[in-house]
């Protein structure tokens, strides 16, 4: 019996087609992805093959203005239109709290939404009961297939699930649900979830009875043969894990942003054992036409977005200096504003000992692309922010050692004065540079804001301590020469859309007045004056 698994993950509100790097589509003849194009390919496969499942491994939420405006209603609507068979909850599905998951998505999806390791307690238990499930048995042709869901245990640190959801260890939670499926005589079982490739492989190894793992969260690109675009494969597709009980378990993931459609063919014997598995992600490029009816629907939904982007979010009473003459040379108040928004977006009081789990932000000055003039009645719109942050990136959470941070700050000024983008803007950090010293030895003071304290204050950076830092995904991936971050980070979780973070902060504050306040100081040691 042959099963075709089509799968997506980490689509992050790319409902419309995008450019090759998953940012806004500029030249339509070279654009990729989007739900209209995805539908064309899915329907083509459904017509050609008998037993097809379309699965999503989480993080449909968050990533473009689509999510900002429609708040998940767009996800339910278009996933229903594409007739997804099941979805696992990702961490970003909780970005607007539990209500922001229940109302737009859980109540409106016409397909099951799954997670076995999220347990509701207190008053939420009865409210959310039955709206998501630990597993689902799906009829496929004359057979049935079991799907068990899982979600990153880190979700309370990455999103806003509130206090009434408990995120359990994935393997511990999955095993009894798989066992339950076995007692129902369901002998073909797929684990579908959102905890990253390392956990996907562990699930394949440790959870008895799981035949296939379809994952997400780590945006892992797997491919067999010559890859069709810019993504470099982390391994073959499918990635084969030998389980502790000696079975070969295929593990797959399909990069992110709807750029590819994962395509895995599995052959089962009559006892539900996997005999063979093969496939590859399909690049959804312009050779695949966009489905006209879905495209028309997208265009209809688009109208509200254009309207939204010109509405006032809040006001500034000061000039927001996002000029390269400032942000690539010294502390600039646009950099301070963005970093403050980044920290504010990551307030999660999950432990009495800590006022917050993260206090530090770094931001490459080259990523700030425009100032905002306060003399336009002080008005700030989404459109204004899109000029400041035009790359459609995310503000991510990383963990790294103090020694890595020190290297990053040395890199920040290693060729100071040439208007290069690596000069870092900061939050929760006080740095002093001596630019008369040789490159690689210019950081003379680096103090960081404590987290395990009731009154936040600045302490010297400790080289061996592990710190959490919020930064653009561009930096986490080693951009602007920050190779040391990419190479040495201990953990990296993708965060919220950059513009969305700043717009939410401005809406919350209503009126903003960020200052240049001595977070970054630089001197040429022999004459001790500061540049501001």
């Amino acid at each position: 019996w042959e099963l075709t698994i089509l799968h997506t993950n980490d689509v992050h509100s790319r409902l419309e087609q995008t450019s090759e790097d998953s940012s806004k589509c500029v030249n339509a003849s070279r654009c990729m992805g989007g739900v209209a194009r995805l539908f064309t390919k899915v329907q083509q496969i459904r017509r050609a093959e008998p037993n097809v499942l379309l699965l999503d491994a989480g993080d449909q939420y968050q990533g473009t203005i689509w999510f900002t405006v429609y708040k998940g209603a767009e996800v339910a609507h278009f996933m229903n239109a594409l007739r997804y068979d099941a979805m696992a909850l990702g961490n970003h599905e909780f970005d607007n709290g539990v209500e922001g998951l229940i109302e737009p998505l859980l109540k409106e999806a016409k397909f099951p939404i799954l997670s076995a390791n999220i347990k509701a307690k207190g008053p939420l238990a009865s409210q959310i009961s039955g709206l998501y499930l630990p597993y689902k048995v799906l009829p496929v042709g004359d057979e049935v297939v079991g799907i068990v869901g899982y979600t990153s245990k880190e979700t309370p640190f990455l999103s806003n699930p509130g206090t009434n959801l408990v995120f359990e260890d994935e393997i511990t939670a999955l095993q009894p649900e798989v066992d339950k499926l076995k007692t129902l005589n369901v002998n073909k079982i797929i684990a579908l979830g959102h905890s990253g490739f390392e956990m996907d492989k562990l699930i394949a190894q440790k959870v008895r009875g799981v035949d296939v793992v379809v994952g997400g969260h780590s945006n892992t690109f797997l491919y067999t043969g010559n890859p069709p675009s810019k993504e470099v494969p982390a391994g073959k597709y499918p990635f084969i894990v030998t389980s502790d009980d000696g079975r070969k378990v295929p593990v797959v993931q399909a990069y992110a942003f709807g750029k590819y459609l994962g395509y895995l063919k599995i052959e089962f014997d009559e006892r539900g054992n996997v005999i063979s598995s093969h496939g590859n992600p399909i690049l959804l490029n312009s050779s695949i036409p966009e489905d006209p009816s879905i495209k028309a629907d997208i265009n209809k939904w688009r109208i509200k977005l254009d309207n939204y982007s010109t509405q006032e979010l809040g006001k500034t009473i000061v000039y927001l200096d996002g000029s390269s003459q400032s942000c690539r040379f010294r502390e600039c108040n646009m950099g301070n504003l963005i970093c403050d928004a980044m920290i504010n977006n990551n307030l999660r009081h999950t432990d009495e000992m800590f006022w917050n789990h993260v206090s530090m932000c770094i931001l490459n000055g080259g990523g700030i692309r425009s100032p905002i003039d306060e003399r336009n009645n002080g008005t700030i719109t989404w459109e204004n922010l899109a000029a400041v942050l035009p790359f459609g990136g995310t503000f991510d959470l990383v963990q790294l050692k103090g020694s890595t941070l020190k290297k990053a700050f040395e890199h920040s000024v290693h060729r100071y004065g040439q208007s290069t983008g690596e000069f870092l803007q900061v939050g929760g950090i006080h740095v002093v540079y001596d630019l008369s010293r040789k490159p690689g030895d210019r950081v003379v003071k680096l103090d960081v804001l404590c987290t395990k304290c009731r009154v936040p204050s600045y302490d010297p950076l400790k080289m061996d301590e592990v710190y959490k830092v919020i930064l653009p995904n561009f930096l986490a991936n080693g951009g602007d020469g920050f190779q040391m971050i990419k190479d040495e980070l201990l953990r990296h979780d993708s965060g919220d859309q950059d513009i969305n973070v700043v717009s939410t902060y401005i809406s919350k504050m209503k009126v903003i007045y960020p200052a240049v306040e001595g977070r970054i100081k630089a001197h040429h040691h022999h004459h001790h004056h500061h540049h501001h």
């Epitope: 409106e108 016409k110 099951p112 689902k136 009829p139």
Partner: nanobody, 124 residues
Amino acid sequence: ALQLVESGGGLVQPGGSLRLSCEVSGFTLDYYNIGWFRQAPGKEREGVSCSSGSGGSTYYADSVKGRFTISRDNAKNTVYLQMNSLKPEDTGVYYCAAYRGWHPSLDARVYDYWGQGTEVTVSS
């Protein structure tokens, strides 16, 4: 929470008719496939009939084809099973059940939500 409550069962003579109702609460009925199942004393639970979310597709077990009709009133959040030409072998507890998905099925394993059941006895 999602709930299904069956009613309309009772004692009926062979050849007679009954109309079972299943009232659902806590969810939008048209997003769910609804099935009727029955369990005779000492026997396995068996699928009788099911209806897709829109009501567009219906399926029947061979043993009841032509005698039973499933219908739904999504506005009233209720699903009905009209049973005509009843036979003694139709006796049992009748359950309604629901699940979200695109493909209606008579396989009990695919159903996630179940009612408590209503008893039907066909006897002279």
